[in-house]
Interface confidence: low
């Protein structure tokens, strides 16, 4: 059956639930987080969480300025419980079929298994077989990077161009993005999107003879990106007299596909597989990020893992009161659910984490963006925030505006690693981001009051303006320093908070049936726009957008 | 935009019994969430009992074991059943209707319908 891991069809069944709804009617719309502090004392003692990572680096979780009280999460905990979220959870890591629509293990857990302890899918230890990938990974990326893999004019590879989409490009670049300081001697560039100026304006930059290019489709039959593949393997062959034997120096494949591989002409001992337990937006811990085993080098790669495979060991170990990425989850839920905020904010106080927001936009909206749960009906709640973000400060001369006075709840994660990589003019930037940082949480959470706006030489109408109500609430999230393994950590963190939304909202986080419609509706009107006729088979408002596409083109 | 319009709303004796009806005005088969408020005077709106489509219901603790929510989707229409009436139950019924899935987000309430408990 499609519901074997969950005996409850809707998450407003939980008596959880019903509690819930009356704390939140009785004191959770009305909690003040101001007030909650004076009463008190220890409750930043009480609500921040450390965690340790391998390499004995720490990072903390601030919950202290979230709309909640001890009996909040004690009853958000027992919402979990009845869930059976732990139960949920010990399935994945057990590698049975928890997508169920898919009949798939979701096993991205065992790619970053670096104790090598057995892990099994349908009577399998795969953990042998991630490890000789992970070999093999380790010697392509030494090869490669130290210059003893040539291209065929004999000259060492400068550049790696990675054609993948989705799964195969977001982890990618927002790791090689995030962990630039580490980077060696290799330049990589990333092409996902269809539209041919993605491609262009990459193959201007590269030199066909120290280009390396990797082609990431798990099926190696993804539209776009074999499409742009083969854009780059033109180039290729057109730039180095169309000899096909070159292409072996110059191609690798990241996917399951032998035949295609082949077909394509790269030599299948270039290729690099992963299964089909591995979703493509948790495939970065695979043969997916060879691009950043080959950017940061494969010790540094391996740090990720072990950085994202620490979480784990803290998600599957730890009591759920101090389970971090189950208390994140479960205040998502909180949010979402009872105070009907739609959104969720990540502000990493960090350029080199641009990306990030992206990234885990895609992770958790693509995982639980389903109105139907793993009983197969429509969920009577509202399911999968509306996730964005962007650097700060950045991001607070836009849309924080919003975040501060805006008729919206927008619950919010602010990111800063205390070290910064960059300590230039003797900290000064770093000092300031970090007073952005810790004021940010405050202002939001403490707002300001008309008697303050009004003390403060304002009057008449501006006063309403400059009020601020405060009480808005927060997260911070306080690192050492951005590390492979911080990074990881934090991806595998908010996985983990994914899975825990997903497993409450008995949703499966792990298909994405959402975007087969459109893919289908394309290949249909592709095939229109191959001819000059007046297309009249859609609804007025398509045939009258490609008709006058078809003018214009 | 969704119309709710209660009905069965009266003055009765403490002890008594009443049947509220909400008829929507359309499907409500995917309307998830309906459900009973109650405003008395100089009091807040107060949640009273729910039904979603997934056949769970739920009850303020004041009405547990008196007051019965049901759900006809073949008739777009949600009822409350009150018996064992206390003065204190008098108020302004209010029917909600709360979309979610698809629908999520929309929210409807009708006019209400007074109900007096009084001997």
């Known amino acids: 059956s499609n519901n074997s891991f969950t005996n409850f069809k809707l998450a407003t069944e939980l008596p959880a639930w019903s509690k819930l709804q009356k704390i939140y009617e009785s004191q959770g719309k009305t909690l003040s987080v101001k007030q909650e502090f004076q009463k008190d004392a220890k409750r930043f003692e009480k609500l921040n969480k450390t965690f340790t990572n391998y390499d004995g680096s720490k990072i903390l979780f601030d919950y202290s300025k979230n709309l909640v009280n001890d009996e909040i999460i004690a009853a958000l905990i027992e919402l979990a419980k009845e869930a059976n979220v732990t139960g949920l959870r010990d399935a994945m890591f057990k590698g049975e079929h928890i997508n169920s629509t898919e009949d798939r293990a979701v096993y991205h857990v065992a790619l970053r298994n670096r104790a090598n302890k057995p892990m099994y899918v349908d009577g399998v230890n795969v953990a042998p077989e991630v490890d000789s990938v992970l070999k093999h990974m380790k010697e392509f990326s030494e090869q490669v990077r130290s210059g003893e893999w040539k291209g065929y004019t004999g000259k060492k590879i400068t550049d790696v161009v990675n054609i993948g989409i989705g799964g195969s490009d977001l982890g990618p670049v927002m790791v090689t993005e995030a962990l630039k300081h580490y980077a060696g001697v290799l330049d990589v560039h990333f092409v996902s999107n269809i539209d041919g100026t993605h491609i262009a304006e990459t193959l201007k930059v590269v030199d066909p003879e120290t280009t390396l290019f990797l082609i990431a489709s798990k099926t190696f039959t993804t539209a776009e990106t074999i499409t742009n593949a083969n854009t780059a393997k033109n180039w290729f062959l057109s730039k180095t007299g169309n000899d096909p034997s070159h292409i072996a120096k110059h191609f690798a494949a990241l996917s399951t596909n032998e035949t295609e591989v082949a077909k394509f002409g790269i030599d299948t001992k270039n290729m690099f597989g992963f299964e089909s337990w591995v979703g493509g937006r948790y495939s970065v811990w695979s043969a997916i990020g060879l691009s950043v085993a080959l950017y940061i080098g494969y010790d540094n790669f391996e740090a990720f893992l072990k950085g994202a495979e620490a979480v784990d060991n803290h998600f599957t170990q730890t009591p759920l009161e101090d389970n971090i990425p189950l208390l994140g989850g479960l205040l998502s839920v909180w949010y979402n659910n009872f105070f009907g905020a739609q959104t969720h904010l990540v502000a990493p106080f960090d350029q080199y984490l641009h990306r990030f927001p992206a990234y885990l936009q895609q992770l958790s909206m693509e995982s639980n963006g389903k109105s139907v749960t793993r009983g197969n009906v429509f969920t009577d709640y509202s399911t999968g925030s509306i996730l964005f973000g962007e650097p700060a400060t950045n991001a607070q001369h836009s849309f924080f505006q919003l975040v501060h006075q805006g008729t919206k709840l927008i619950p919010s994660d602010f990111i800063l690693a205390a070290q910064s990589h960059n300590p230039i003019e003797n900290k000064l930037h770093q000092k300031m981001l970090a007073s952005n940082f810790f004021a940010q949480a405050e202002a939001l959470m403490v707002g300001k009051d008309e008697e303050q706006v009004k003390a403060e030489g304002a009057t008449g109408g501006l006063v309403p303006h400059k009020v601020f109500s405060g009480n808005r609430p927060t997260t911070s999230i306080l690192a050492q320093k951005i590390t492979p393994a911080t990074l990881g950590a934090l991806i595998a963190y908010y996985e983990h908070v994914t899975f825990t939304e997903g497993a409450i909202w008995n949703i499966n986080s792990f298909d994405q049936w959402g975007v087969e419609l459109g893919k289908v509706l394309a290949k249909v009107i592709g095939k229109e726009l191959d001819n000059s006729s007046t297309i009249s088979t859609h609804d007025a408002s398509t045939n009258g957008l490609i008709n006058q596409f078809k003018e214009w083109m | 935009q969704v119309q709710l319009v209660e009905s069965g709303g009266g003055l009765v004796q403490p002890g008594g019994s009443l049947r509220l009806s909400c008829a929507a005005s359309?499907?409500?088969?995917?309307?998830?969430?309906m459900g009973w408020y109650r405003q008395a005077p100089g009091k807040e709106r107060e949640f009273v009992a729910g039904a979603t489509s997934g056949g769970s219901t739920d009850y303020a603790d004041s009405v547990k074991g008196r007051f019965t929510i049901s759900r006809d989707n073949a008739k777009n229409t949600v009822y409350l059943q009150m018996n064992s009436l206390k003065p204190e139950d008098t108020a302004v019924y209010y029917c909600?209707?709360?979309?979610?899935?698809?629908?999520?987000?929309?929210?409807?309430w009708g006019k209400g319908t007074q109900v007096t408990v009084s001997s």
């Open positions: 359309r499907s409500i088969v995917t309307i998830n969430v």
């Open positions: 909600n209707l709360r979309g979610t899935g698809y629908n999520y987000g929309e929210n409807y």
